[in-house]
């Protein structure tokens, strides 16, 4: 029999680890898409929404050629930690209107935490430094109104979806370069 469940493997194939991270990211992307669609159905968005406290997009067509694994994993982990904080804030301060989405938001938070653990494991296996965020953490105050929390939810889910979408593409690309 192999090592007990949950024990770290002695040696590891980085491509297999990256594969596993891609699968988790894809799965979270699908969950986020579903929840964002649910949000749009329950609370139709009037135009676009943004939040100053959300991370700026790290990837685009222009950055794909110069992607490197350490930078991508570090930035992705920092950005996802920010989104995790925003999801936690939504669940805590979102108000009664968002309580109807509580089971889904809770599941999303759990999957986000799982992906973050996987990224941390991957970074430690690749002997990459576990960098702390270089931007100061902006404290998240309570939403100004019930409508404010709905707008924030649209912005958070939309931003997370976009970040994960690019993350899948970036990780797939990096896998071919390992």
């Amino acid at each position: 029999p192999g090592p007990p469940a949950g024990s770290p493997r002695v040696s590891s194939d980085p491509r297999a680890d990256l594969d596993s991270a891609v699968l988790l990211t894809r799965s979270l992307l699908a969950d986020t898409r579903q929840l964002a669609a649910q949000m749009r159905d329950k609370f139709p968005a009037d135009g676009d929404h943004s939040l100053d406290s959300l991370p700026t997009l790290a990837m685009s067509a222009g950055t794909l050629g110069s992607l490197q694994l350490p930078g991508v994993l570090t930035r992705l982990r920092v950005d996802l930690m920010s989104y995790l904080r925003h999801v936690q804030w939504l669940r805590r301060a979102g108000g009664p209107s968002l309580k109807t989405l509580e089971p889904e938001l809770g599941a999303l938070q759990a999957r986000l935490e799982r992906l973050l653990r996987r990224l941390q494991l991957l970074m430690s296996r690749l002997a990459l430094p576990q960098a702390a965020p270089d931007q100061p953490v902006i404290p998240l105050g309570p939403p100004a109104s019930a409508w404010g929390s709905i707008r924030a939810a649209h912005a958070i889910l939309g931003g997370l979806h976009l970040t994960l979408d690019w993350a899948v593409r970036g990780l797939l690309l990096l896998k071919t370069r390992l």
Epitope: D48, A61, V168, L172
Partner: antibody, heavy 117, light 110 residues
Framework: EVQLLESGGGLVQPGGSLRLSCAAS????????MNWLRQAPGKGLEWVGV????????FYADFVKGRFTISRDNSKNTLYLQMNSLRAEDTAVYYC??????????WGQGTLVTVSS | QSVLTQPPSASGTPGQRVTISCSGS????????VNWYQQLPGTAPKLLIY???LLPSGVPDRFSGSKSGTSASLAISGLRSEDEADYYC???????????FGGGTKLTVL
């Protein structure tokens, strides 16, 4: 609701120029890479090029390099395609499309460009 | 000549399951995500499948995608008359540094 609306198509002579526009609404335009694609009458889809969300990076298909230029104005939520030295084989419906990664998740309705003398 | 290869046509009767194939190489399908688009007659294309097998919101789960090696396929179960359309596969090509498409498959519901 995400909407993309192309305009500027029409009839132009070979060797002539045309500028297409794509007005975007319903999303944060400055967060998304944007593409132009085309479809010749009765033919398949063909990718023309992409511009990164902030506008500083552009990539083109080989058949348009040096002739077509993609640009964007994020303050106006508008994407552009400047087409020069047009040829008969550039006759097609031109679509703008949004990219959140590797795919085109929203497309405009298209604008027809006819290159003929 | 398209970089990705699709059969020009496919057909089926209502309720049937049909599959459309798309073959490429290691520089496109082998190393990159495959996306599928549906183009109904006289309309713009619409995203049907992304990242090999994910469905955008609003697309019925009768549609599914899969990928193996340098080939991909789109399956439509419980075929309906409104599925009659052109279907295109697409992927990024590392060698060409471009998005490439299949030539399209015209699906007829008999």
């Amino acid at each position: 609701e995400v909407q993309l609306l192309e305009s500027g198509g029409g009839l132009v002579q070979p060797g002539g120029s045309l500028r297409l526009s794509c007005a975007a609404s319903g999303f944060t335009f400055s967060h998304y890479d944007m593409n132009w694609l085309r479809q010749a009458p009765g033919k398949g889809l063909e990718w023309v090029g992409v511009i990164s969300y902030e506008g500083s990076n552009k990539f083109y298909a080989d058949f348009v390099k040096g002739r077509f230029t993609i640009s964007r104005d994020n303050s106006k939520n508008t994407l552009y395609l400047q087409m020069n030295s047009l040829r008969a084989e550039d006759t097609a419906v031109y679509y703008c499309a949004r990219t959140p990664g590797s795919h085109f998740d929203y497309w405009g309705q298209g604008t027809l460009v006819t290159v003929s003398s | 000549q398209s970089v990705l290869t699709q059969p020009p046509s496919a057909s089926g009767t209502p309720g049937q399951r049909v599959t459309i194939s798309c073959s490429g190489s290691s520089s496109n399908i082998g190393n990159n995500a495959v996306n599928w688009y549906q183009q109904l007659p006289g309309t713009a294309p619409k995203l049907l499948i992304y990242y090999d097998d994910l469905l955008p919101s609003g697309v019925p789960d009768r549609f599914s995608g899969s990928k193996s090696g340098t080939s991909a396929s789109l399956a439509i179960s419980g075929l309906r008359s409104e599925d009659e359309a052109d279907y295109y596969c697409s992927a990024w090509d590392d060698s060409l540094n471009a998005v490439v498409f299949g030539g399209g498959t015209k699906l007829t519901v008999l």
